[in-house]
Amino acid sequence: SIPWNLERITPPRYRADEYQPPDGGSLVEVYLLDTSIQSDHREIEGRVMVTDFENVPEEDGTRFHRQASKCDSHGTHLAGVVSGRDAGVAKGASMRSLRVLNCQGKGTVSGTLIGLEFIRKSQLVQPVGPLVVLLPLAGGYSRVLNAACQRLARAGVVLVTAAGNFRDDACLYSPASAPEVITVGATNAQDQPVTLGTLGTNFGRCVDLFAPGEDIIGASSDCSTCFVSQSGTSQAAAHVAGIAAMMLSAEPELTLAELRQRLIHFSAKDVINEAWFPEDQRVLTPNLVAALPPSTHGAGWQLFCRTVWSAHSGPTRMATAVARCAPDEELLSCSSFSRSGKRRGERMEAQGGKLVCRAHNAFGGEGVYAIARCCLLPQANCSVHTAPPAEASMGTRVHCHQQGHVLTGCSSHWEVEDLGTHKPPVLRPRGQPNQCVGHREASIHASCCHAPGLECKVKEHGIPAPQEQVTVACEEGWTLTGCSALPGTSHVLGAYAVDNTCVVRSRDVSTTGSTSEGAVTAVAICCRSRHLAQASQELQ
Amino acid sequence: QEDEDGDYEELVLALRSEEDGLAEAPEHGTTATFHRCAKDPWRLPGTYVVVLKEETHLSQSERTARRLQAQAARRGYLTKILHVFHGLLPGFLVKMSGDLLELALKLPHVDYIEEDSSVFAQ
């Protein structure tokens, strides 16, 4: 029987008695920045090359005894999880280890930086195939460590890191908080977030996805044939590094953005019990557990999108929050969310030649989040069309008037503090799916895109009575690009996308009378690309 | 994930330009910033990563490091350049007294300085 963690990441079609997925990442090199390792362990012998890089601080304490097996335990186990013969994810991947953690598992930001620089120089001297860098470590938030990760990622390297074992917001740690790295939290055999002593896995918007990270069997440095169970977000990150190696081996040309989108797309959705996370973090934490794709040939025909949450704006009246997509992703829609419901909407705006999503806090509000829907849309030409507040009672409207442009998202932003409390709801006229409609006192922003074969449609779900949550999902084959609420519902806290579902949240129904304003309508814009589908068929 | 985000401490030292043979005010009137880990036990004072502006060449990094050493020596401080970065970020790693931070922040090409801190196996 295969260990639970390998079974969990393996799609059903691979599940035989033995974990033997095709092509085990042989075209990929995985760099491990960790403790020293026992490279002659039978699990990893011949698979891991120990570089001469070492940058570690001295061990603490006068009574510390350097015991080789203790010094090697963390790194050896992780190397085994990534590429071990019996218990590894990507059995064909070759690895290189750099020692940046001492025998107590402690290192420095500076040592890690020098290690990352070593990898970049090695890459320049001897370019190989795709590179994955595994960073199974965490320290406090570090601007310089995040910046170094960003530079390495922009040089085409995939960085995977541990979210941290502090049962805390991963955004407070580095490199977990670097947007360019793939940050991994840990779950157990019951798909619960991992508890470690009094602490446990980190969570929050800086986590990209979760992976098995409790009771993971792997190589033990106690002897060359020993195995041991270890736990932590390092083990979870090692699983994702292995999955990334498998994906890159199958499709070596994948960019970081494409890889991240695929990791998210093929993950198991909504299996984690969110009650474990602090209440204010639940909406921000992705409910995703990593898995290998069901086949090794590409899923290039799909329109991939993910949701990116901003940092919290803070409570000041003019506070704003900004959510950004990765460099090779398109921002297809922008929404906002506030727990207090006091917000002034959101807008898409250009910043440094790229669209960003900005949400606006309102007077008396506790702060807002901006939520960007970031998609992979090759050859896309997107723009934002804005209509200022209308004078007419019919409300503000804006549509995509350029030939061949389709509507991918609607945003609205207003200056008045309490929009809609004394106004009747505005309903969007039927049969006009290519336009955004909003309150007459709001400016409306339409995201309009032209891309080969791109088609979109609007889907609505309205509930006449007040409800805390209204959802509408795109059907199979379509991808959610836009998520918003129809105007006129004053008690709406905001809208956001969860996988392929648009969620509109309202204030607690007990505080909202069952008036005409109780009606809540969630509006989803669902798109697909016929061009991507055709291109994929031609490749096959 | 946000690059500008994080519960870290930022000390922005707005500095007067002192008369000092080698000191130049940072260009465009921008002020270099100092960062350190918010988690006190993880701080490693005495070692600093001096990050230079993006397009700074290796020779300029080395020159800036030497300049810092010279100015520190003039004030009676010993410094040690532990590493000069190039390839990913321009800058250098220096072992020095925290008393010299004000001086270092005024060096040409300096974008920000970060105090070294611990990282841990997870």
Epitope: K70, Q104, K106, S220, V228, S231 | -
Partner: antibody, heavy 130, light 107 residues
């Protein structure tokens, strides 16, 4: 699924010796500490001894110290209990059990998190009588 | 050595009842306590670890609580299959000790 099968029990005279074996399946055997637990007729459970994955650490209940030796052979996926100087009070059903636990790091310290004995053998009976 | 004392030694109850078994440690063991169920002629089965974590595959009617020296095992609604002997076990150190057991029988 991991299975544990004990053998080696039997009737022995006081002062005699016996060697119990426990055969396991799968790589998970060598990944965990292992224990021997005994149960005298009509009585409760008594932990006897345990051993680390690589055999480098061993612990015993006071009443068997110096008489019993726990060992394991990773290559054979086997656990052993060598019992010398047996006494009447050692009469019991002897179970081998897997001590499921995991190691993790927390801010520079290596910790052990123990779940309990999650897999047990069916037991082997040892009778010490003249 | 740490002593573990279970109470009661025997407990009579009916199907559907809510029952509680207590385990007391002679010194603090934090949350390092497990509960086992044993039926006649069978090996014990792990139910709860770390005082309150439910082992995989164990019905949710079983729950554990406590820390320090006082611990309880609760069965929210007794099922016919639950009549057995229950043991607590401490593992504050690498040397373990069991409680003397609580026999749960049909009233």
């Amino acid at each position: 699924e991991v299975q544990l099968v004990e053998s080696g029990g039997g009737l022995v005279q006081p002062g005699g010796s016996l060697r119990l074996s426990c055969a396991a399946s799968g790589i998970t055997f060598s990944s965990y500490w292992m224990s021997w637990v005994r149960q005298a007729p009509g009585k409760g459970l008594e932990w006897v001894a345990n051993i680390k994955q690589d055999g480098s650490e061993k612990y015993y209940v006071d009443s068997v110290k110096g008489r019993f030796t726990i060992s394991r052979d990773i290559a054979k996926n086997s656990l052993y209990l060598q019992m010398n100087s047996l006494r009447a009070e050692d009469t019991a059903v002897y179970y081998c059990a897997r001590d499921r636990g995991t190691y993790y790091y927390a801010s520079g310290s290596y910790n052990y998190y123990y779940y309990g004995m999650d897999v047990w053998g069916q037991g082997t009976t040892v009778t010490v009588s003249s | 050595d740490i002593q573990m004392t279970q109470s009661p030694s025997t407990l009579s109850a009916s199907v559907g009842d809510r029952v509680t078994i207590t385990c007391r440690a002679s010194q603090s063991i934090s949350s390092w306590l497990a509960w086992y169920q044993q039926k006649p002629g069978k090996a014990p089965k792990l139910l709860i670890y770390k005082a309150s974590s439910l082992e995989s595959g164990v019905p949710s009617r079983f729950s554990g609580s406590g820390s320090g020296t006082e611990f309880t095992l609760t069965i929210s609604s007794l099922q016919p299959d639950d009549f057995a002997t229950y043991y607590c076990q401490q593992y504050n150190s690498y040397s373990y000790t069991f409680g003397q057991g609580t026999k749960l029988e049909i009233k």
